[in-house]
């Protein structure tokens, strides 16, 4: 189920400015989603929220080439990985000074993918083989999901596959940036 069908051998990471020297521990268990061993950058004020009742988690971005067998993407893609401990936004780091650091008790909250997007990838293959065109599934955003004790471990392994997408016929999610736009952004970053 979920992401078990994941097939990607990419390990070539392109560090981004201000990246973490090592990934948060949460990332290390998520090998079904990506095989990258490091990467990502600090979240943009992830715990600042207008709604204090909201639960927050981190969205880590990292850039890498993706591969399919011997073939590698002509250009890198920027991926997003959901990470971090979920907790009431008002009790996250800003509240440490007041001695109210949130500790999970009872229901468990996990940071999981909320929405997905596709990005076109051109794969270049060795030996004069023709290029391949594929669409890669990337996480578009993350959310905190409440997992009760009745949720089994497979859901955690599968990134909490209960993540919901808006009813697409009525309320489509914002248009994802095109592959070209993403690439332009990447190129400008170097």
């Amino acid at each position: 189920q979920g992401w078990q069908a994941f097939k990607n051998d990419a390990t070539e990471i392109i560090p981004e400015l201000g990246e973490y020297p090592e990934p948060p521990p949460e990332l290390e268990n998520n090998k079904t989603m990506n095989r990258a061993e490091n990467g990502g950058r600090p979240p943009h004020h992830p715990f600042e929220t207008k709604d204090v009742s909201e639960y927050s988690c981190r969205e880590l971005h990292f850039t890498r080439y993706v591969t399919d067998g011997p073939c590698r993407s002509a250009k890198p893609v920027t991926e997003l990985v959901c990470s971090g401990q979920c907790g009431p936004a008002r009790l996250l780091p800003n509240a440490i000074g007041r001695g109210k650091w949130w500790r999970p008790s009872g229901p468990d909250f996990r940071c999981i993918p909320d929405r997905y997007r596709a990005q076109r990838v051109q794969l270049l293959c060795p030996g004069g083989e023709a290029p391949r065109a594929r669409k890669v599934r990337l996480v578009a955003s993350c959310k905190c999901k409440r997992l009760t004790r009745f949720h089994n471990q497979s859901e955690l392994k599968d990134f909490g596959t209960e993540a919901a997408r808006p009813q697409k016929g009525r309320k489509p999610r914002p248009r994802a940036r095109s592959a070209k736009a993403n690439q332009a952004e990447l190129e400008n970053a170097y």
């Epitope: 078990q4 929405r115 596709a118 669409k135 890669v136 596959t161 997408r165 248009r175």
Partner: antibody
Framework: EVQLVQSGAEVKKPGASVKVSCKVS????????MHWVRQAPGKGLEWMGG????????IYAQKFQGRVTMTEDTSTDTAYMELSSLRSEDTAVYYC??????????????WGQGTLVTVSS | QAVVTQEPSLTVSPGGTVTLTCGSS?????????PYWFQQKPGQAPRTLIS???DKHSWTPARFSGSLLGGKAALTLSGAQPEDEAEYYC?????????FGGGTKLTVL
């Protein structure tokens, strides 16, 4: 593995609407790209519309625009296709089809069993 | 809207080789059309054989292969079996829009 189970056959009168459901199991609907395809008796496959994960929106075939609505209930992992202003030429088997999940998008990998909609006065 | 064309019917001898093609009214078919090939037998739902030009699936027999040939998408069947007799459909992506071909009735005779 993704499995799709569609609602049963329907008989409708011209001018009426029909709503076909497609229940997903094995994955959650929010992970998948759902499309709808129909096939009139003795004819070929005809794409009606589906979710484009690159654009993040549902796209409808020009032919059906204004007459078809595709929605999803992620709480029950059920997709719906509603076709209005039915005419006799809408008599067909209606299929839902999704990608296989996983890292690479592979569309139309899993198909429902089909729902026969008969439009007759 | 684009029109996707296929041979209406083809015949192949058992053990023989046949190539089905899929053309586009808009011009040359490229990898950016992400050609798909489906097999459908009477009374059954379609079954995907090839995705993204040449990508086979776990259930796709090795005798089927996808490629681009002379500006069209192609499905080649090498070593035809009686059970390969079916209707074959191609599909092309035009951005987010999808268009099916009219289908090729393949007879193994």
């Amino acid at each position: 593995e993704v499995q799709l189970v569609q609602s049963g056959a329907e008989v409708k009168k011209p001018g009426a609407s029909v709503k076909v459901s497609c229940k997903v199991s094995g994955y959650t609907l929010s992970e998948l790209s759902m499309h709808w395809v129909r096939q009139a008796p003795g004819k070929g496959l005809e794409w009606m519309g589906g979710f484009d994960p690159e654009g993040g929106e549902t796209i409808y075939a020009q032919k059906f625009q204004g007459r078809v609505t595709m929605t999803e209930d992620t709480s029950t992992d059920t997709a719906y296709m509603e076709l209005s202003s039915l005419r006799s030429e809408d008599t067909a088997v209606y299929y839902c089809a999704t990608d296989a999940g996983g890292y690479w998008y592979k569309f139309f990998q899993h198909w429902g069993q089909g729902t026969l909609v008969t439009v007759s006065s | 809207q684009a029109v996707v064309t296929q041979e209406p019917s083809l015949t192949v001898s058992p053990g023989g080789t046949v190539t089905l093609t899929c053309g586009s009214s808009t011009g040359t078919v490229t990898i950016d059309h992400y050609p798909y090939w489906f097999q459908q037998k009477p009374g059954q739902a379609p079954r995907t054989l090839i995705s993204d030009t040449d990508d086979k699936h776990s259930w796709t027999p090795a005798r089927f292969s996808g490629s681009l040939l002379g500006g069209k998408a192609a499905l080649t069947l090498s070593g035809a079996q009686p059970e390969d007799e079916a209707e074959y459909y191609c599909l092309l992506f035009y951005g987010g829009t999808v268009v099916f071909g009219g289908g090729t009735k393949l007879t193994v005779l």
